[in-house]
Interface confidence: low
């Protein structure tokens, strides 16, 4: 007869690992007992359990409540194990021993691989500002066995780089992704994948980038001047810009304080019926906690009636 | 079977230090977690610390983090609870136990010390 | 943390009289659930692990059920040397927990 086992047996950790251990033998053997055994190089065997045919199993102490036999129906000839709750520790060399009657003892080896699956993190990195050079996004590090594999899933472009971490038993791989910042980036995804032979799919962790930028400030509403003449209605002026974190307008005159009348309404300032007060130079400031900028714009209240005195003027010139 | 003997307890004065000291025999002691548990006078269990087979993994309860450190000399067979910052209410009896498996969170205990009392006052 | 309440925190009985202890988790555990049994200036024994499997050595008259976050410790027929205080503890997450104890007294 011969014993059929496997070489290696791979499990998740926190499995139950099927140690296999069967006999083929010729008809009429029988087989004794089954000794089950740890037997990693540089120590000593330390006893899993004994199969016996008269008095069942026995676990030894250090394995109590984590040896099982599988479930009925089971075969004589069958010296499988279960091994409950796979952990790091129970990694190693196992050796089934085999008493058979009446053709003698035989013995395999096999080695247990426990997979433990990683528990990724990702870290973002410093805040981001339009106009840093190459910066940390984010870093993600995953620690499993073996080691994880960690890449990058993103349409932004940048550069990455990995180092990994040998522990005793398993291995921590942590992988940074650097960009150089740009107000395109924001809301952009940058996904960290993770795979390991001990998750059924991909992990990913997602990080959603936030540049801060402020866009130049430029005011609009002066576009046709002949608009702004006394006794128009509705006239305002509106600051633009854009930016992250959105920015807040204040606005103020160069000349002197805001005349009455005119309302603040964020990054708009209206104004009441134009006369010649409203004239003057108006500066929109725009500022986030990343940067503040200024615009500023002249507005000359035209009077029709000088205007048109003057158009005459020109007539009789003529 | 395995034995485990506690040793190191007595009286201290508050914001004092004790070292506890577990000697196992009679067992393996290398390949299991271990831990300590203890129990104030009149009351119940609380898990206090628990260590790993090779020393790297060691856990604490919140009421202990940076005051007490667990530790192992497997060549000794003997576990050790260096506590420091003494307070009243760490006043128990202190046992020290195998756990079933080698891990330091959790897991049952299989095998326990007498226990060892620590009396913390002035 | 996970919390651990059993019930009832005592009771009294009778030798031969059939003792149920529950306990709760304030969370699922699977079956990462012990019982131990403990007399007065003793340590504690375990009884049962995995929720309901024999410690080796324990009398058969206890058993434990239960999966998830509720468990019972049964003693089927009570003996002299069963009174004493009984708690049980998870170990599905660190720290692990135990319950407040349950004492069992002669009627």
């Known amino acids: 007869g011969e014993l059929e086992t496997s070489d290696v047996v791979t499990v998740v950790l926190g499995q139950d690992a099927k140690l296999p251990c069967f006999y083929r033998g010729d008809s009429g053997e029988q087989v004794g007992q089954v000794a089950w055994a740890r037997v990693d190089a540089g120590e000593g065997a330390q006893e899993l359990a004994l199969l016996h045919s008269k008095y069942g199993l026995h676990v030894s102490p250090a394995y109590e409540g984590r040896v099982e036999q599988p479930p009925p129906p089971r075969n004589p000839l069958d010296g499988s194990v279960l091994l409950r709750n796979a952990v790091q520790a129970d990694e190693g060399e196992y050796e089934c021993r085999v008493s058979t009657f009446p053709a003698g003892s035989f013995q395999a080896r096999l080695r247990l691989r426990v997979l433990v699956p990683p528990l990724p993190s990702l870290n973002p990195g410093p805040a981001l500002e339009e106009g840093q050079g190459l910066t940390l996004a984010a870093s993600c590090t995953a620690e499993g066995s073996p080691a994880p594999s960690v890449t990058w899933d993103t349409e932004v472009k940048g550069t990455t780089s990995s180092r990994s971490f040998k522990h005793s038993r398993s291995a921590a791989v942590t992988s940074e992704f650097h960009l150089v910042p740009s107000r395109s980036m924001n809301g952009q995804p940058l996904t960290c994948v993770v795979s390991h032979p001990g998750l059924l799919q991909d992990q990913r962790i997602t990080h959603i980038l936030h540049v801060s930028f402020l866009a130049e400030a430029s005011v609009r509403g002066l576009e046709d001047q002949n608009l702004w003449h006394i006794g128009r209605e509705g006239a305002m002026l509106k600051c633009l810009s854009e930016g992250q974190p959105p920015p807040s307008y204040n606005w103020t005159r160069l000349d002197g304080p805001l005349p009455s009348g005119v309302r603040v309404d964020g990054d708009t300032l209206g104004f009441p019926p134009l006369t010649t007060e409203h004239s003057g130079i108006y500066v929109c400031h725009v500022s986030n906690e990343f940067s503040s900028r200024d615009s500023q714009v002249t507005v000359d209240v035209l009077d029709p009636q000088e205007d048109s005195g003057k158009q005459v003027d020109l007539v009789s010139a003529s | 079977e395995v034995q485990l003997v506690e040793s190191g307890g007595g009286l201290v004065q508050p914001g004092g230090s004790l070292r506890l000291s577990c000697a196992a025999s009679?067992?393996?002691?290398?390949?299991?977690?271990m831990s300590w548990v203890r129990q104030a006078p009149g009351k119940g269990l609380e898990w206090v610390s628990g260590i790993y087979s090779h020393d790297a993994d060691k856990r604490y309860a919140d009421s202990v983090k940076g005051r007490f450190t667990i530790s192992r000399d497997n060549s000794k067979n003997t576990l050790y609870l260096q506590m420091n910052s003494l307070r009243a209410e760490d006043t128990a009896v202190y046992y020290c136990?195998?756990?079933?498996?080698?891990?330091?969170?959790?897991?049952?205990?299989?095998?326990w010390g007498q226990g060892t009392l620590v009396t913390v006052s002035s | 943390d996970i919390q651990m309440t059993q019930s009832p925190s005592s009771l009294s009985a009778s030798v031969g009289d059939r003792v149920t202890i529950t306990c709760r988790a304030s969370?699922?555990?699977?079956?990462?659930l012990a019982w131990y049994q403990q007399k007065p200036g003793k340590a504690p024994k375990l009884l049962i692990y995995?929720?309901?499997s024999l410690q080796s050595g324990v009398p058969s008259r206890f058993s434990g059920s239960g999966s998830g976050t509720d468990f019972t410790l049964t003693i089927s027929s009570l003996q002299p040397e069963d009174f004493a205080t009984y708690y049980c503890?998870?170990?599905?997450?660190?720290?692990?927990?135990f319950g407040q104890g349950t004492k069992v007294e002669i009627k």
């Open positions: 503890q998870q170990h599905y997450t660190t720290p692990p927990t």
């Open positions: 009679g067992g393996s002691f290398y390949g299991f977690g």
């Open positions: 995995a929720a309901s």
């Open positions: 136990a195998r756990q079933t498996e080698d891990r330091s969170y959790g897991y049952d205990l299989d095998y």
């Open positions: 969370q699922g555990i699977s079956s990462y």
